[in-house]
Amino acid sequence: LIIGFGISGRHSITVTTVASAGNIGEDGILSCTFEPDIKLSDIVIQWLKEGVLGLVHEFKEGKDELSEQDEMFRGRTAVFADQVIVGNASLRLKNVQLTDAGTYKCYIITSKGKGNANLEYKTGAFSMPEVNVDYNASSETLRCEAPRWFPQPTVVWASQVDQGANFSEVSNTSFELNSENVTMKVVSVLYNVTINNTYSCMIENDIAKATGDIKVTESEIKRRSHLQLLNSKAS
């Protein structure tokens, strides 16, 4: 969490941002809140990015003001217009690009004063893994697949019964570049699995950590997946 304070002749206002991550090709949100004002027409929101000449986005007098917007953000940014009045200056970013990563500043002017806070935005790709029994294999085998990751993640297998065991000798992981030549499909195979055990396939890079669990018994197969972003620090 980053909390910034204004430093101007007028009073300073508190602006709060949260570091976050964007999944390339999907929509993202850069979070920013501020002390609200009672009049929308008195609020100015400016989003800036380190190293970028033009503005990322400007919202003033209740509407977008995009004459100074940088080309790289054209057509891709919006604030939550109906929530500005309650202090939400968060930015929607359409179709997140790898190059959107960097340091952003959320700068606010209201009738009470000015304030700003920085935000670190990471970009990459992350997706939920799915673990299945590979019936085509000669021995009892599990296959863990996740369609989109970037940067290249690590894959670790674990089991409930053999806690702390190292499965690297009995697993094989491959990374296949997807058609857009950035993200990769992750496939990991675990051999010699036993029934009545829960196995977990854990995929992690510096942006996200995802786990796919599978429990195989004589009578049924239970699956569960979970994904967690790693860098949600507030400022």
Epitope: D27, F59, K63, D64, R74, G75, R76, A78, N95, Q97
Partner: antibody, heavy 121, light 107 residues
């Protein structure tokens, strides 16, 4: 006023490729997304994908990722969609539409008149 | 992929109020689905009506309004007119793709 003018009907052979166009007039072409939509009788509307003119930014419906390719030429304010390896399943009317993404709303507003594609041997 | 469901047909009379709905197979429709409503008249004449759940496209008559009703997106025509007889499609955004409903024929 805003207009999206699409190219004329096409009759193509299976296996061929076709490139259809959507010429935009009356607005700043590079500030709006161009969406491509497929309409087949009994199948409703299917979103193919979108392009932001003046950038290389595109989004494709997974189903059409191999089939469709979008390009846009900002000098002529024209968006293009190429469909490859045509089959009878590709016979349809294809529309381009303008999509506005902004703080106050997100909407499809203007649509082209459609390009009819027939794939037949 | 999500499935978006609309009433296949509705009948109304001039002056009446009619509501068309749009349901998502993935759960409740929210403002993050940016619900859009599009009208199709004969000869493939499409016009955008509503975007972002409840914002009228500029130039669209005030009798058209969008909202969320329960877990669905809705298009309400207050005081329907004969020229409103058409096909109405909703479209929902799912983070990186649009899905259209099957359309409602309004008679």
């Amino acid at each position: 006023q805003v207009q999206l003018q699409q190219s004329g009907a096409e009759l193509m052979k299976p296996g061929a490729s076709v490139k259809m166009s959507c010429k935009a007039t009356g607005y700043t072409f590079s500030s709006y997304w161009i969406e491509w939509v497929k309409q087949r009788p009994g199948h409703g509307l299917e979103w193919i994908g979108e392009i932001l003119p003046g950038t290389s930014i595109t989004t494709y419906n997974a189903k059409f990722k191999v089939k469709a390719t979008f390009t846009a030429d900002t000098s002529s304010n024209t968006a293009y969609m190429q469909l490859s390896s045509l089959t009878s399943e590709d016979s349809a009317v294809y529309f381009c539409a303008r999509y506005y993404f902004g703080s106050s709303s997100f909407y499809f507003d203007y649509w082209g008149q459609g390009t009819s594609l027939t794939v037949s041997s | 992929q999500a499935v978006v469901t609309q009433e296949s047909a509705l009948t109304t009379s001039p002056g009446d109020t009619v509501t068309l709905t749009c349901r998502s197979s993935t759960g409740a429709v929210t403002t993050s689905n940016y619900a859009n409503w599009v009208q199709e008249k004969p000869d493939h004449l499409f016009t955008g009506l509503i975007g972002g759940t409840n914002n009228r496209v500029p130039g669209v008559p005030a009798r058209f309004s969008g909202s969320l009703i329960g877990d669905k997106a809705a298009l309400t025509i207050t005081g329907a007119q004969t020229e409103d007889e058409a096909m109405y499609f909703c479209a929902l955004w799912y983070n990186n793709h649009w899905v259209f409903g099957g359309g409602t024929k309004l008679e």
